[in-house]
Every structure is written in structure tokens, then in C-alpha cells.
């Protein structure tokens, strides 16, 4: 059946009409408009942009557009007391200081309010001491240092290169190792692609460029002072000592010119292997401290940033559904940027703007979606996903009852090679079917589908002839919807070739050089990749909001559950003796997965055959589909992470950006051989298997015939 039948509208208002209305030229124009000045969260400039977007969404035709404000903890450098790092001699004189800010890009020399590079939420402090180089500061890097090399980081200032994992995890690891300060830097090995010029002549990071970013370990809490509840006018706020996720040691980021000065003098141990060497002309010695001639010199950090409760503003637009107005499909992306936001977030915000305009055009012609579509421009994402989380906390009762799906819309591009999708398994078939209908923008794939170019360039590691779709992790605004509330979620963007470009993210990420010109000159001059991403994101929203039967396939969840069960079992089987000793069995989990598979298969058969003209039965079947994701939520949450409640997926405890499957079991098994009380540790593994098995079985039963 056509996805329009239920809304009694003319056939011309279908997905094609929506997609045809999307224009690359408009996305380009919107991107330019959004990137001329900085839009840092909590600033007047970002408030003005919120009001502009509110006004334009109203003009585009949405039914209502409101600002939702919250007063949350943000962090800013001290304008009169800048942050920097020094090398000091034995007399305490500063013989080298890091740069106070990045040289501005051409055309932006006279722009005011460019926030200098800083690590948001760093405490104040002026620690001094010997330096230890800790590679990427991953869990395994500290294992190598402490266990294999017997290097003690206690009382040291550590220097870590950006990349591989979320910076907050690096800081947490350094704290646990006893460090008294952290210096983060961008190594050319990770942020300078060979054969490409640095900005403004290419998309590589110049030596004076620096990555900003927050260093929180919120674990989904939102505003650090009001975990679990909205930061509204009558909120009770924790004291700063009880705030969630704040780092306890000073942290500061630098570029590779300044890193060279710190690393070139390093003495102590040689790097353990080549994976610890970057591309600077330095030895990458681990330390501690400087080499012979410089051994009396120390490193000193000067950090004076302040944490301040500040008002932020989300923009929430509503396009009311004609048939099921109490079912919400949400498209959201953030508006706040570190500086100009040329890629992050405005390449995404410009796409959302054009999607809203297209939906508005259809609405003005008399069309309405079947279900309500909510559009969101989130604030303070860069400070810990605060805007989206506070709004979801405020509206959690509505969302858990009415939320069908959330589609995220941060950066539309991180490269221009192929599509990248992370989503719930429920959306796999939706994404496959949609991309088969869209044209590929890729060179050499003229006249071919997006599905074809995507599958060719990014094949699934498991299923031939299919594209790779990844697990959702975190580090973006879908987190609260998926990990806390259990609303089916997905994200899509254009990405780089991970085979040939091993650098982390894109080189100019969170630097002053992330400008409109970066996108227009080097990434997407024709804005054809932006248009494709608009078609994917918008197409997903259209289908989720308009199809009579929700475009979710529960059988795909069954497939991945089996895969994840196999994976976690094989991890556990690395300890066969202990599994025997402590009677650890995965039978209950595999049994639950088998049951889920059978019940999902039967449900899918019923879904093909039921009478779609019966609105009660239709609603019943759709509710079973909608609530399936919700069924994977454990109200008690994961151990020590109460806001990560999804039993199948959570952000990795070692890298917030990455998704982990069966995270409760995974974390219980992690490094289990080093636990002081093996009996207790394996007891926790058994408990987590029990929780996972119960949850999968309970979720399966939500798909059973209701009576």
C-alpha cells in the first residue's frame, strides 16, 4: 500500500515530492548563514541564532516553534587570565610558553569572541612536574605503562595524543593513574593526512591548530548539577563537589607546534613499540621527565577556566500528525559550536533547516504526515549533550509513551567518500530500502543507487552484498533517547575512507579552521554529499512518520542478538578454567535469543497478514514495534551508570564514542584476570548474564500475540 493512503491526501504528496523539494543550493546558503560568527553555547550569539531558527521554521510552515530554556553548568576560559603551559627552569622561570590561541583563518581576522582552545570543565590549577607521554591515554596504554614498563604516573603531568577514543576517557584514565595534569595534543600522524595541504590550502590541521572539547565523564547524566531531572527554574542543584562527571585535575589542549617543544626534550624510557610513535621529529620517549641536559626543567600548567551556570536554548518545532498525533518522530541536531562550526554542527543544522523547509512546503500544499514530527535544534551539545538531555528529562514521560524514533543530525560530513550509518537494528531494513531508492552522488557511480556505492565502498563484514551499519555509541544527542529512554534511533553522514585515512575524525575538528570555506572549497563544493545526507535523514523521518506500518524489522534484532551472544561467549571462553570453577553458563542467554528469534519470526508473519484497515489492530501492531526498543531498557541501569539503561547497547566504558554490545557482561569480564577477588568478579559475570537473558526474553514476549 502507498504510505499516503491513511492520510487521505493526493498521491503527489509522497516521499518523492519531499525528496525533490530538497535543494543543494539551499543547504549551501543555510550553511553560510550559520557559520559567519561563533555560536558558543551560552552566548548571546547562539541565543540570537536560536531566535532566527525559530522565526524561519515558523515561516517554513511548522505548526508551532518554541524555545525551551535550561540553566546548566558550562565552562569558559578566563578572558583576562589565559590558560597556557610552560617549561620552567630550575629557578622557576618560564623558558617556553604554549600559544594562547590559534592564528585566525583568512577573512576572520577581525571576528570577536573566538574562544581560545581549552578543555571544557577543567578545574583550575597550576600543577608542575615531570612529563610522561602516554600515547592515546587509552586503557591499554596505561596497562602497557604501568604493568609492562613499570612506569608510575602518580604525581606526573601526562601528555596524550588526541584520537582513537573520546577525550573524557583519556582524562579519566589519567586521573585513575594518579596524574596531576593532562596535556592533550593533535599529532600529525592522526590529524595530518599525507599529500594534503594544511588549511587554508587544504583540509589538514596547521601546527597552530588546536582541538577544543569537553572532558566530562557524564555517562548520560546531562547537566552535571541536576542528574535525572531538568535544569529548570525550580531545580535543586548539587554542590560543585557532588557534580556528576567533572574532572579532578587540570587539562589543556595544544597543537603540534607546541607539542614538539614539550616532546623533543623527553627522556626516560623509549617508546615500547612503533604504535607509540607519531609523526613529529621527536623520539617519543615516555619519560618520566626530560633528558640529561634538561632534566632540571619541569612542565607547568596554568589553568584558570571557570564553571558557570548559564542559560541555554533549544528550538523545538512541531508538525502535527494527521492520524496519530500522539506518536512522535524526532529529527534533532545541535546548533552550538566551538567556533564557526563549519562542519560540526552547522553542516548538519543546514540539512535540518532544508528538511524542515521541504516538509513545510508540503504542509502548505495541504499535506500532513501520519504521525507528529518534532524538529529540534539542540544547545550545549559540545558541553556534554546538555540541551537534548535536559529536554528529554523534562519530557521523559511523554517520550517513553509516544516516542517512535529519533534521527540525529549533527555533522553531515566527516569526509566525502561514502555513507556511514549507525542505528538500531530495527532500522536496518528502512535504511537499506531507502538507499536503494536514492541516487549515489559518488564519482564513478553515476546512475547507480546510493545503496550500491555504499555497499561497494563500505561492505558489511558479515553479510556479502550489504553495507556496513554500525552500533550506536554516544558522543552525540541521540544518547538520551536511545541509551536512557529506549527510543529507536539512527544517524547518517558522509565519511572518509577509513582504509586509507587512519587519522581520527577529520583533521580540523573543533578548531578555528572549521569554516564555511573548508566545506565549500575542499569537502563538498557542489553540496551533493550534503544533499544526499539530507535525503537519507529526511527520507528516514518521512517513512517513520508516514508509513502505515512502522518500517521496523524485529528479525534484524534477532540476528544481531545472536551475533552479540556469540561474541561475548567467546570472550568469556578465554577463561575456560574459571568458567568451570564458578559454574558460568551462557545457556540462559542463548535460550532467550533463540526464543526471541522464533517469536520475532512469527510476529513478522503476522505483520504481513493482518488487516491494515482495522485501526485498532494496526495501532496494536505498531505499538509492539514501537515498544520493542523500550523493552531492552533496564530501569536500574548498568552498574555505576544509571543513565545507561539499554541492556543490548551502551557506550564503551573505555571510549564513549564506541558502542558495546551486552555491555553489562562485557564490563564484568573486562580485565577479570586482574581482579583481587575472582569469586566476586565471576559472580558479577553470572549476574550480568542473568540480567541480559531476562531482558532478551522479556523483550521477546512483547512481540508475542497479545492474548
Amino acid at each position: 500500500k502507498s504510505s499516503n493512503e491513511a492520510t487521505n491526501i493526493t498521491p503527489k504528496h509522497n516521499m518523492k515530492a519531499f525528496l525533490d523539494e530538497l535543494k543543494a543550493e539551499n543547504i549551501k546558503k543555510f550553511l553560510y548563514n550559520f557559520t559567519q560568527i561563533p555560536h558558543l553555547a551560552g552566548t548571546e550569539q547562539n541565543f540570537q541564532l536560536a531566535k532566527q531558527i525559530q522565526s524561519q521554521w515558523k515561516e517554513f510552515g511548522l505548526d508551532s516553534v518554541e524555545l525551551a530554556h535550561y540553566d546548566v553548568l558550562l565552562s569558559y576560559p578566563n578572558k583576562t587570565h589565559p590558560n597556557y603551559i610552560s617549561i620552567i627552569n630550575e629557578d622557576g622561570n618560564e623558558i617556553f610558553n604554549t600559544s594562547l590561541f590559534e592564528p585566525p583563518p583568512p577573512g576572520y581576522e577581525n571576528v570577536s569572541d573566538i574562544v581560545p582552545p581549552f578543555s571544557a570543565f577543567s578545574p583550575q590549577g597550576m600543577p608542575e612536574g615531570d612529563l610522561v607521554y602516554v600515547n592515546y591515554a587509552r586503557t591499554e596504554d596505561f596497562f602497557k605503562l604501568e604493568r609492562d614498563m613499570k612506569i608510575n604516573c602518580s604525581g606526573k603531568i601526562v601528555i596524550a595524543r588526541y584520537g582513537k577514543v573520546f577525550r573524557g576517557n583519556k582524562v579519566k584514565n589519567a586521573q585513575l593513574a594518579g596524574a596531576k595534569g593532562v596535556i592533550l595534543y593533535s599529532d600529525p600522524a592522526d590529524y595530518f593526512a599525507p599529500g594534503v595541504k594544511s588549511y587554508p590550502d587544504g583540509w589538514n590541521l596547521p601546527g597552530g591548530g588546536v582541538q577544543r572539547g569537553n572532558i566530562l565523564n557524564l555517562n548520560g547524566a546531562g547537566d552535571p548539577l541536576t542528574p535525572g531531572y531538568p535544569a529548570n527554574e525550580y531545580a535543586y542543584r548539587r554542590g560543585i563537589a557532588e557534580a556528576v562527571g567533572l574532572p579532578s585535575i587540570p587539562v589543556h589542549p595544544i597543537g603540534y607546534y607546541d607539542a614538539q617543544k614539550l616532546l623533543e626534550k623527553m627522556g626516560g624510557s623509549a617508546p615500547p613499540d612503533s604504535s607509540w610513535r607519531g609523526s613529529l621529529k621527536v623520539p617519543y620517549n615516555v619519560g618520566p621527565g626530560f633528558t640529561g641536559n634538561f632534566s632540571t626543567q619541569k612542565v607547568k600548567m596554568h589553568i584558570h577556566s571557570t564553571n558557570e551556570v548559564t542559560r541555554i536554548y533549544n528550538v523545538i518545532g512541531t508538525l502535527r500528525g494527521a492520524v496519530e498525533p500522539d506518536r512522535y518522530v524526532i529529527l534533532g541536531g545541535h546548533r552550538d559550536s566551538w567556533v564557526f562550526g563549519g562542519i560540526d554542527p552547522q553542516s548538519g543544522a543546514a540539512v535540518v533547516h532544508e528538511i524542515v523547509r521541504s516538509f513545510g512546503t508540503l504542509k502548505k500544499e495541504g499535506w500532513r504526515p501520519r504521525r507528529t514530527i518534532l524538529f529540534a535544534s539542540w544547545d550545549a551539545e559540545e558541553f556534554g549533550l546538555l540541551g537534548s538531555t535536559e529536554w528529554a528529562e523534562e519530557n521523559s514521560r511523554l517520550l517513553q509513551e509516544r516516542g517512535v524514533a529519533y534521527i540525529n543530525a549533527d555533522s553531515s560530513i566527516e569526509g566525502n567518500y561514502t555513507l556511514r550509518v549507525d542505528c538500531t537494528p530495527l532500522m536496518y531494513s528502512l535504511v537499506h530500502n531507502l538507499t536503494k531508492e536514492l541516487k549515489s552522488p559518488d564519482e564513478g557511480f553515476e546512475g547507480k543507487s546510493l545503496y550500491e556505492s555504499w555497499t561497494k565502498k563500505s561492505p558489511s563484514p558479515e553479510f556479502s552484498g550489504m553495507p556496513r551499519i554500525s552500533k550506536l555509541g554516544s558522543g552525540n544527542d541521540f544518547e538520551v533517547f536511545f541509551q536512557r529512554l529506549g527510543i529507536a534511533s539512527g544517524r547518517a553522514r558522509y565519511t572518509k575512507n577509513w582504509e586509507t585515512n587512519k587519522f581520527s575524525g577529520y583533521p580540523l575538528y573543533h578548531s578555528v579552521y572549521e569554516t564555511y570555506e573548508l566545506v565549500e572549497k575542499f569537502y563538498d563544493p557542489m553540496f551533493k554529499y550534503h544533499l544526499t545526507v539530507a535525503q537519507v535523514r529526511g527520507g528516514m523521518v518521512f517513512e517513520l512518520a508516514n508509513s502505515i506500518v512502522l518500517p521496523f524489522d524485529c528479525r534484524d534484532y534477532a540476528v544481531v542478538l545472536r551475533k552479540y551472544a556469540d561474541k561475548i561467549y567467546s570472550i568469556s571462553m578465554k577463561h575456560p578454567q574459571e568458567m568451570k570453577t564458578y559454574s558460568v553458563s551462557f545457556d540462559s542467554l542463548f535460550s532467550a535469543v533463540k526464543n526471541f528469534t522464533e517469536i520475532a519470526s512469527k510476529f513478522s508473519e503476522r505483520l504481513q497478514d493482518f488487516d491494515k484497515s482495522n485501526p485498532i489492530v494496526l495501532r496494536m501492531m505498531n505499538d509492539q514495534l514501537m515498544f520493542l526498543e523500550r523493552a531492552f531498557i533496564d530501569p536500574l541501569g548498568l552498574p555505576d551508570r544509571p543513565f545507561y539503561r539499554h541492556v543490548i547497547y551502551a557506550p564503551s566504558s573505555h571510549n564513549k564514542y564506541a558502542g558495546e554490545s551486552f555491555p553489562g557482561i562485557y564490563d564484568a569480564l573486562f580485565d577479570i584476570e586482574s581482579k583481587v577477588d575472582p569469586s566476586k568478579a565471576w559472580g558479577e559475570v553470572k549476574r550480568q548474564i542473568y540480567v541480559a537473558a531476562f531482558t532478551v526474553q522479556a523483550a521477546a514476549e512483547t512481540l508475542s500475540e497479545v492474548a
Epitope: 623558558i95 617556553f96 610558553n97 600559544s99 594562547l100 590561541f101 590559534e102 592564528p103 585566525p104 583568512p106 581576522e109 595541504k197 594544511s198 588549511y199 587554508p200 590550502d201 596547521p206 601546527g207 597552530g208 607546534y257 617543544k261
Partner: antibody, heavy 120, light 106 residues
Amino acid sequence: EVQLVESGGGLVQPGGSLRLSCAASGFTFSDYYMAWVRQAPGKGLEWVANINYDGSSTYYLDSLKSRFTISRDNAKNSLYLQMNSLRAEDTAVYYCARDLDGYYGYFDVWGQGTTVTVSS
Amino acid sequence: EIVLTQSPDFQSVTPKEKVTIQCSASSSVSYMYWYQQKPDQSPKPWIYRTSNLASGVPSRFSGSGSGTDYTLTINSLEAEDAATYYCQQYHSYPLTFGQGTKLEIK
């Protein structure tokens, strides 16, 4: 040996034109931004113009933008400065310089300079 | 445009003495460069990115500073150091030089 050799200087009347050339050798010319810097008699250094690797972007001292044009020919390892509507205050030694840090300008190799005299 | 002001304009110094030349920027800059020029010679790169010595520069020279205030220091002056020193900002166009500081040996 890395070398820059300027030529084309001389005496010119006010309102006249001159084209300076700089021949580069001993390095991969197209891998560097290049610049012209001048020094009036008994005065300090004054940056005139920069050009990026392939000549697609040029940057000038504002007061000279309408009269001076920097260009390069990578095939010939050569840098040029076309100077029109010359004035007495343009009298200076003009140095060609290699710019090590790209757009932001650190001049690590200098030529010996060529003298331009604007006088009637 | 960022104006760089060097002080002093001129300094007459005894060999072995410590010398400091200041360069003050009208607004903050990211890095400072220094050049040495002797009479009838081209300028030579001397210190780059605030504190790095160019190739062949003696270790008695050092550079430091950040923001608006930068310093070139000669720990123990030698006769061959007599020259004019120029600072230059690495920050924004137009690229600008200080007016120069002439060092003379007493």
C-alpha cells in the same frame, strides 16, 4: 644548496612599471608559499605580498593591492612581482623569501635582494 | 593591522653582557619570529615560533613570551652579535615587522 636570486630591479620614473623575478633552486618550489618583503633605504622590513603553493591565493599589504601583483610559475621555479604606477615611496630593496609555515608566514630563506629606485 | 613595537630602538652593549630585546604587539598574537640583519646583507631567520632557534644560531640566544609580549635574549653577548634584530608576527595579515633594534658592541 637552497638559493633565491632576484632580478629586474632598476631605476624607473614615477608612474612607471617594473617586473621583478626570483629564481629558486635547491628545493621543491611548489611545496612552499613564497613572499616579497621590501626595505626602504635606512628603514625596517615591510612585508609586501604572499602567494600560496599553486598561485590560487594571493595576499597583499592593503596599500599596495591595487598596484602590485604577485605570481608564480612552478614549472620554471620562478616568483614574480609586477609593480605598476610606481611612486617614490616604493623605492626599496625587494627581497624574495621562502615561507616555511605556509599561510602564516615565516621566512626561512631570503634572496640577496634587488634594488628598485623610483625617481624622476 | 597588528603593530609591533620593539624596545629599545638602539642598544650599546659590552661583550659578555646579557641582552634582552622586547617586542610588544598591539593585540595578542600566536607566535613571534625574529630575524637578524647585518649591514648590506639580507635578513637571516633567527628564532621561529617564539622560542625555536633557526639552524646555525648559537645557543646563547633564546626567545620567549606569549600573547602581546615577547622577548629575544642573548645570554652572553659576543662581537658577532652586533646587528639589527626584527620581530615579526605570525598571526594575521598583513604580516608585520617591528621597527628593529640595533645592537652595537661597546
